[in-house]
């Protein structure tokens, strides 16, 4: 009787089962969330899982469907989208992906009043952007880089602009560069809020520097691949923003915007637009030397039909000890009295926090405050203001959503999910419906990801909308690792880390550490998430410790850490890499002769820098398509860093910090280089250099390539990638197979 | 299941107005957004008023500022008062959800403008 619980406790264990490399592969323990796709204060469509699109109303508790699965796959629709006024609806096909964000496709409109696809006058195929207009059903689209618009879905197109040509002139849609580092989206075009006016961008890329490499094929001969792509002190785009009136397009046709003269002094990025009201426009712009940045707000002028923005409102932001802004320059948030706005910006702690400015930056009026930053303010409605930070329990690598009255004196702040699930939900992000009269909760860990919907008054959950529970059955019986998240103290600087153990994991054995790193600025890897992934089953199955460090240049814990790597890109990245190995063979758990690092993109440049640091600490280690030199890469992304690589600029860095410069380092380690040779973002030049640099030094060293795989290493790459680095390391850590 | 009935059609000089009515019955009530639509003689029916659970209304252009959508939930009805009529609002005049679903449309009611 006393040994029965005993055994029925051991035979429970013995059904666990270890993570397999076949179960991260083919996605078996992979989570939903649910974003609505609000269309109203109170109303959402979501496509259901047999593919209908269904309209929910969350007042009346009824829920139909307005577009059946059976008119979706007449015409193979994997996307749609509504016209607000309710008629129309558009429905994607033949997507085709370009670059990171862009991606072709074939549009077709379906008429909901009259249950039929509608004939005539049909787009063109296939097309780079479409979209509704706010109120209505207008169209805006972008054909081979021009932009036409139609007053209705049946209507003849009226052609906005005439001059776009293929990698030259770009139109409502961005060039490669602006695409990946400055916009984040695969349009540039924006209706005004009652679409009245349309503005756009047209990105001038006639005398930008190509990058031309081979793509393989099944032909007889590769095809070459031309992108107009700005390295690092290359000549830019040339960018002007238009805008035109919707209703009269041929009156005076687009008008020009102009550009803050402190600005147009010099080289400049236009970085974004804010529509506040029809005839207020806001702009944002950058000096190439990306310290300056200026926000513009614009008015229309009846009288000439042109757009004015006067200096005095102008208002300028300026980082002294590093870059303006985080990644991006953050984007205004406007108020009702449509002038005054909300935005995120450094405090004189050196904190990112959200400030109110009325008249001028300098009278900005902080609504945050304290030790941890401000990350996303997700609406301003005319009584609260809602927004994420890692303020609580001071863990940087959290999220919480939180409500600021901003109706009653003095302002009262409310932490609106601190406390909903706090085991199972330490980061959130939200989507709000208009008014915000409901939200949606996402809740992505560090338990099984769960989506919530709520009252925006009162903040109470009314339904969930997504809770995993097939993945939470899935999981109970898999001997997941275990997670912890905590900080090392060294030198005055805070090193979060994540560790992530073997599920037996006895702190008095030995066990191989891997070093998973990214490390770029503003990135964060420490973050309160659930993941079931590669590490995840290396940790699981095959017993190995596993280690994510945010070392200096890293975000959301302030400027001294996050512009500690101004201008010196390589250096202390790594550095708080080996710290923190350092400190974690010190906690005794480690096998100090079974030590790796792997690392991709920016990580595989700081993986390449750590195993040449001649520290010996590493054993071995894995750089996938890493950069390895700054002069390779973008522009945008690499200058706001470093500055220009001119000897009166920061030239000297720009050499000192490439992997090849250390190329005799790696003899004493076991490096395995990866890298697609169709990799647009990090050009396999930047590996094509190292090879060449080891070569030379005759040293030895693994690699492989996949043949016309970009920066992400998608589909079947993945599991050869995955299977290949996994054998590398169990061969690295005398692991049996 | 569900029934839409409209009501309050008919011949009026150009300038007048009509108020219509649409009695909604079966499963869905009168709360969820709903629309006016009107097709008229040879052309595509089309979107005229719609009115969010909300109260949030959205117009066709060319009724903006004379027509007006409301609804009784009591009543569980829904309306379009019509005003400043043009010969060119002559149609048939039904309601639905809005957006419409296929299934939902009733027989309508008729409004012609004599000028």
């Known amino acids: 009787i006393v040994l029965r619980p005993s055994r029925v406790h051991n035979s429970e264990e013995n059904t666990m089962r270890a993570l397999t490399l076949k179960d991260i592969l083919n996605g078996t323990f992979s989570y939903k969330t649910f974003f609505p796709n609000w269309i109203s204060g109170q109303e959402y469509l979501h496509q259901s899982a047999d593919n209908n699109i269904v309209l929910y109303n969350i007042e009346t508790g009824q829920s139909y469907t307005i577009l059946s699965n059976r008119t979706m796959k007449s015409v193979n629709a994997s996307n749609y989208g509504l016209s607000p006024d309710r008629q129309f609806v558009y429905l994607e096909s033949d997507y085709s992906k370009l670059w990171r964000y862009s991606y072709t496709a074939t549009y077709y409109i379906y008429d909901l009043s009259n249950g039929e696809f509608v004939r005539g006058n049909e787009l063109p195929r296939p097309i780079q952007y479409l979209c509704w207009s706010p109120v209505g059903s207008k169209l805006a689209y972008v054909y081979q880089n021009n932009i036409y618009l139609k007053q209705r879905p049946g209507d003849p197109p009226f052609q906005i602009t005439f001059n776009g040509r293929e990698n030259k002139i770009f139109n409502g849609i961005p060039d490669w560069v602006y695409e990946e580092e400055m916009l984040a989206t695969k349009y540039a075009l924006w209706w005004s809020p009652n679409g009245k006016f349309l503005a756009y961008a047209e990105f001038n890329d006639t005398d930008i520097p190509v990058i031309a490499y081979s793509y393989y094929g099944d032909e007889q001969y590769p095809r070459t691949i031309n992108i107009p792509y700005p390295k690092a002190g290359a000549k830019n785009p040339v960018v002007r923003i238009f805008i035109i009136d919707t209703t009269y397009p041929a009156y005076v046709g687009p008008q020009e915007v102009p550009v803050p003269a402190m600005i147009a002094s010099s080289d400049y990025y236009f970085s974004w637009l804010t529509w506040v009201t029809d005839e207020r426009v806001c702009l944002q712009w950058l000096k190439r030397v990306q310290n300056v940045s200026v926000l513009s707000i614009c008015d229309f002028r009846e009288d000439w039909q042109t757009w004015d923005c006067p200096k005095t409102q102008e208002h300028i932001e300026e980082s002294r000890t590093g870059w303006a802004g985080g990644f991006f320059v953050s984007t205004p948030v406007f108020s009702y009295d449509a002038i005054s706005y909300y935005k995120i910006f450094s405090d004189k702690d050196g904190y990112k926090h959200i400030h109110y400015i009325k008249d001028t930056v300098e009278n900005a009026i902080q609504i945050t405050s304290g030790k941890w930053e401000a990350i996303n303010i997700f609406r301003v409605t005319q009584d609260s203001l809602f927004y994420s930070s890692n303020e609580f329990e001071e863990y940087p690598g959290r999220r919480n959503i939180y409500r600021i009255s901003i109706g009653s004196y003095p302002p009262s702040k409310k932490c609106v999910t601190c406390h909903l699930r706090k085991e199972r939900c330490q980061y959130y992000t939200a989507s709000f419906s208009d008014y915000a009269k409901y939200y949606a909760l996402v809740c992505y860990g560090p338990g099984i990801p769960i989506s919530t919907l709520h009252d925006g008054r009162t903040d109470q959950e009314i339904k969930i909308l997504e809770e995993n529970k097939e993945l939470e059955n899935a999981l109970k019986n898999i001997q997941l690792p275990k997670e912890e998240i905590k900080k090392l103290e060294v030198d005055e600087i805070t090193l979060w880390y994540k560790m992530i153990l073997p599920p037996q994991f006895d702190r008095s054995k030995k066990y191989p550490l891997l070093i998973q790193v990214y490390g770029g600025p503003c990135s964060q890897s420490v973050r309160s998430v659930f993941a079931v992934n590669w590490i995840s089953y290396l940790a699981s199955k095959e017993g190995m410790v596993i280690a994510l460090v945010d070392g200096r240049g890293t975000a959301f814990q302030g400027d001294k850490l996050l512009y500690a790597v101004y201008r010196k890109l390589g250096v202390y990245e790594v550095e708080d890499q080996i710290t923190a190995v350092r400190k974690f063979i010190e906690m005794g758990f480690i096998d100090e002769k079974r030590i790796a690092i792997w690392g991709w993109s920016y990580g595989g440049y700081v993986s390449s820098l750590a195993l040449a640091s001649g520290t010996g600490l590493f054993k071995c280690g894995i750089a996938v398509a890493p950069v390895s030199s700054w002069e390779y890469y973008a522009s945008v992304y690499t200058e706001r860093f470093m500055g220009l690589p001119t000897k009166d600029d920061n030239l000297e860095h720009y050499k000192n910090s490439t992997v090849m410069a250390r190329a005799e380092y790696f003899r004493n380690v076991d490096y395995l280089l990866i890298h697609g040779t169709a990799d647009d973002n990090v050009h396999f030049q930047n590996s094509a250099q190292i090879a060449k640099a080891l070569v030379n030094a005759q040293v030895d060293f693994q690699a492989m390539w996949y043949s016309d795989q970009n920066h992400g290493l998608s589909g079947l790459s993945t599991n050869h990638l995955y299977t290949h680095m996994t054998h590398f390391l169990k061969q690295c850590f005398s692991l049996s197979d | 299941d569900v029934q839409l009935v409209e009501s309050g059609g008919g011949l009026v000089q150009a300038g007048g107005s009509l108020r219509l009515s649409c009695a909604v019955s079966?499963?869905?009530?009168?709360?969820?957004?709903m629309g006016w639509y009107r097709q008229a003689p040879g052309k595509q029916r089309d979107v005229v008023a719609g009115?969010?659970?909300?109260?949030?209304?959205h117009y066709a252009d060319s009724v903006k500022g004379r027509f007006t959508i409301s609804r009784d939930n009591a009543k569980n009805t829904v309306y379009l008062q019509m005003n400043s009529l043009k010969a060119e609002d002559t149609a048939v005049y039904y309601c639905?959800?809005?957006?419409?679903?296929?299934?939902?449309w009733g027989q309508g009611t008729q409004v012609t403008v004599s000028s």
């Open positions: 639905n959800l809005w957006p419409p679903v296929q299934g939902y």
């Open positions: 079966g499963s869905i009530s009168s709360a969820n957004s």
């Open positions: 009115l969010t659970t909300g109260g949030r209304s």
